[in-house]
Interface confidence: medium
């Protein structure tokens, strides 16, 4: 068999939410991969599994199943969103997401994720992690092509 | 290392008010929650109230309400709870914990507070 | 208000085996960021809690493996892989999802 390509493209969105009682932030992150089948049969996506994290916690985790088949030779673009919460200890973040005064509120996020492919009863996991900024003082929609400069080489922890 | 410091066993008469202290060291004081936590003896644990010492805001468990104040001071790196009109119900163990790294995930070794005519 | 439910005792157990503590929450810990904040504290006697577990699973900083945790969004079991004399006091497990935060009455762990 030929490789199965996984390649993470990078954050597509992410919608903000506050609770102030709370000093709570709901970040809903929609982030985007690309799959490749260099194959010449086609291949099942069963199942991709997600997690973020910030300062080494994980704020979320999401799990989608039965995804998509790709074809023979076929590329396939898959959004998949992870609900995220930024409280408790890390409370200290509510202000600096919601303080006026601040115009960028870019936090470095981890995202890691999992894809998991079948083919003729084979399975086979391929993972990835990347170093995001993400906004959490607004919602945002990023290009892809800004995908670049969203990539953190060097995150500060 | 974090540590968190309360002061002294308090013996109170009924009707009085009485301040506990919790001195915080080895982090940033003004980033982390303090909650007070309630032991009676031989008891379990009661969650009071939080307060956020970075702004001071608070939040209080309604069967608290009135009997706890929580105040926090950034310069000294203490914070405070006020426990006021005393009465045998509140004769406890006080403890102070906070939020750093985790959830009540250091706590203050306790105060014992009685209250006796 | 999330109420913790805790049996008060544990069954006895051997030093050396293994023992198990229960918890039961009154709704559903598990968020829809697919975290549960269940917590899992010990008092030994004479001293203040410390935590052991955090988000149902996760041991926290210093604890030995020994211990261990899992469940449901509402059930929830502590296990103590081998009982050491150290190990004796008071589990109690809350719950960290809502405000108030709640705690479990406590289950006092015995040693026959």
């Known amino acids: 068999p030929r490789s199965i390509e996984v390649k993470y493209i990078g954050v597509k969105s992410a919608y903000v939410s506050y609770d102030a009682e709370k000093r709570t932030i709901y970040l809903n992150i929609t982030n985007t991969l690309n799959i490749t089948n260099n194959n010449y049969y086609s291949v099942e996506v069963e199942n991709i599994t997600a997690q973020v994290q910030f300062s080494k916690t994980v704020i979320g985790k999401a799990r989608l199943n039965n995804i998509t088949n790709i074809g023979p030779l076929d590329m396939k673009q898959i959004d998949y969103t992870v609900p995220t919460v930024i409280a408790e200890e890390m409370s200290y973040m509510y202000d600096f997401c919601t303080l006026l005064s601040i115009k960028v509120h870019n936090i470095v996020l981890m995202m890691q994720v999992t894809v998991t492919t079948a083919y003729f009863g084979h399975s086979e996991q391929i993972s990835q992690e990347r170093y995001q900024y993400v906004d959490c003082g607004r919602n945002t929609t990023y290009q892809l092509a800004q995908s670049e400069y969203l990539n953190v080489l060097q995150p500060q922890q | 290392q974090v540590q968190l410091r309360q002061s002294g066993a308090e013996l109170v008469r009924p009707g009085a008010s009485v301040k506990l202290s919790c001195k915080a060291s080895?982090?940033?004081?003004?980033?982390?929650?303090i909650n007070w936590v309630k032991q009676r003896p031989g008891q379990g644990l009661e969650w009071i109230a939080r307060?956020?010492?970075?702004?001071?805001?608070?939040y209080y468990n309604e069967k608290f309400k009135g009997k706890a104040t929580l105040t926090a001071e950034g310069s000294s790196n203490t914070a405070y709870m006020q426990l006021s009109s005393l009465t045998s119900e509140d004769s406890a163990v006080y403890f102070c914990?906070?939020?750093?790294?985790?959830?009540?995930?250091?706590w203050g070794q306790g105060t014992l507070v009685t209250v006796s005519a | 208000d999330i109420v913790m439910t805790q049996a008060a005792f544990s069954n006895p157990v051997t030093l050396g085996t293994s023992a198990s503590i229960s918890c039961r929450s009154s709704?559903?810990?598990?968020?829809?960021?697919?975290?549960?904040?269940l917590y899992w504290y010990l008092q030994k006697p004479g001293q203040s809690p410390q935590l052991l577990i955090y988000?149902?699973?996760n041991l926290a900083s210093g604890v030995p493996d020994r211990f261990s945790s899992s469940g449901s969004g509402t059930d929830f079991t502590l296990r103590i892989s081998r009982v050491e004399a150290e190990d004796v006091g008071v589990y109690y497990c809350?719950?960290?999802?809502?405000?108030?935060?709640?705690f479990g009455g406590g289950t006092k762990l015995e040693i026959k």
């Open positions: 914990a906070n939020h750093y790294t985790n959830p009540f995930a250091y």
């Open positions: 080895g982090y940033t004081f003004t980033d982390y929650y």
């Open positions: 307060i956020y010492p970075g702004s001071g805001y608070t």
């Open positions: 709704k559903s810990l598990l968020h829809y960021n697919g975290i549960t904040y």
């Open positions: 988000q149902m699973s």
């Open positions: 809350a719950q960290n999802l809502e405000l108030p935060y709640t």
